[in-house]
């Protein structure tokens, strides 16, 4: 099955202190590799989240990532700060050994604004 | 310390059942896969069967789909195999092992030695 | 099926380089485990084709390419003389397997 990587939600908005949750789904695992979450683009982009086993404060998975066919990576963030605001992307990595993953596809983008409480 | 303890091996007859056990310790059980890996004796290793972190979902090898259940009690940090009809050819030690985010093995119990004998 | 050597065997302070092949880089992450004697618990030296667990010596590494995986030992020691069985995950299939081991021997 082709690869594709969804992100239904172009934007949502979220009350500081409270948590959102960003979809992504993707219809196939093939290649074999890391999914990864960023916000902004280009070489400055921040990695957000890993779908490696690192731990991060304030993100979780929302479905159970460890299911060998689970193809929804959607993040909860808790505790939103104005801070968390941006554009987020949710991309897919074919593996790399010797040279680092190579980036295969990335979801459209979900832009966060954070009201004021 | 992380740890993983299998239990429950034994000499049975064949046919009949045997259910092991895993107790897990020094890591939160409830977030990650666990397997089954078994080895006869003088052989290698073979994967048997796979549980996701909440359970949900299961995964066997051929050879012991229908006979071998894998399931686990995050409630008390435990991996169970349920082994039924067993015959010489499922003698081995049995291992557990959790596995790493792309269902790869990053530790491993002791073992328990299975006998099949008449 | 995934295919390794028999047996390798090296002298003290060489590098030793274990094959393993059969696997589709496309769908399959690569393992290696030791096991020092039959029946022991194996210990993961590489998983992901080439993360060390960090209780594991520097002087273990791994790589895949194509559709074979590669543990290299560099300055292999004696207590490195151990079975090494190399492992796969295929995500096509959801099935993990394993070679048949690799005897290591230094002389």
């Known amino acids: 099955k082709e690869l594709k990587v969804t992100q239904p939600e172009k934007s949502v908005s979220v009350a500081a202190g409270d948590s959102t949750v960003l979809n992504c789904t993707l219809t196939s695992l093939l290649p074999v590799g890391p999914i990864r979450w960023y916000r902004g683009v280009g070489p400055s982009r921040l990695l957000i989240y890993s779908f490696a086993g690192e731990y991060v404060p304030r993100i979780r998975n929302v479905s159970d990532t460890t299911k060998r066919n689970n193809m929804d990576f959607s993040i909860r963030i808790s505790n939103v700060t104005p801070a968390d605001a941006g554009i987020y992307y949710c991309v897919k990595f074919q593996k790399g050994s010797s040279e680092p993953d190579t980036e295969i596809q990335s979801g459209g983008g979900t832009e966060v604004y954070v009201l004021a409480k | 310390d992380l740890q993983l303890v299998e239990s429950g091996g034994g000499v049975v007859r064949p046919g009949e059942s045997l259910r092991l056990s895993c107790a897990a310790s020094?890591?939160?059980?409830?977030?990650?896969?666990m397997s089954w890996v078994r080895q006869a004796p003088g052989k290698g290793l073979e994967w048997l069967a796979g549980?996701?972190?909440?359970?949900?979902?299961?995964y066997y090898i051929d050879s012991v789909k229908g006979r071998f259940t894998i399931s686990r009690d995050n409630s008390k940090n435990s991996l169970y195999l349920q082994m039924n009809s067993l015959t010489a050819e499922d003698t081995a030690v049995y291992y557990c092992a959790r596995e790493t985010w792309n269902h790869l093995f990053d530790y491993w119990g002791l073992g328990t030695l299975v006998t099949v004998s008449s | 099926a995934l295919t390794q050597p028999a047996s390798v065997s090296a002298n003290p302070g060489e590098t030793v380089k274990i094959i393993c092949s059969g696997g589709?880089?496309?769908?399959?992450?690569y393992g290696w485990y030791q096991q020092k004697s039959p029946g022991s618990a194996p210990v993961t030296v590489i998983h992901s084709d080439d993360k060390r667990p960090s209780d594991i010596p520097s002087r273990f590494s791994g790589s895949a390419s194509g559709s074979a995986a590669t543990l290299t030992i560099t300055g292999v020691r004696v207590e490195d003389e151990a079975v090494y069985f190399c492992?796969?995950?295929?995500?096509?299939?959801?099935?993990?397997?394993f070679g048949a081991g690799t005897t290591l021997t230094v002389l």
């Open positions: 020094g890591f939160t059980f409830s977030s990650y896969a």
């Open positions: 492992g796969a995950y295929d995500g096509r299939t959801y099935i993990n397997t």
């Open positions: 549980i996701s972190a909440g359970g949900s979902d299961t």
């Open positions: 589709d880089y496309y769908s399959t992450y």
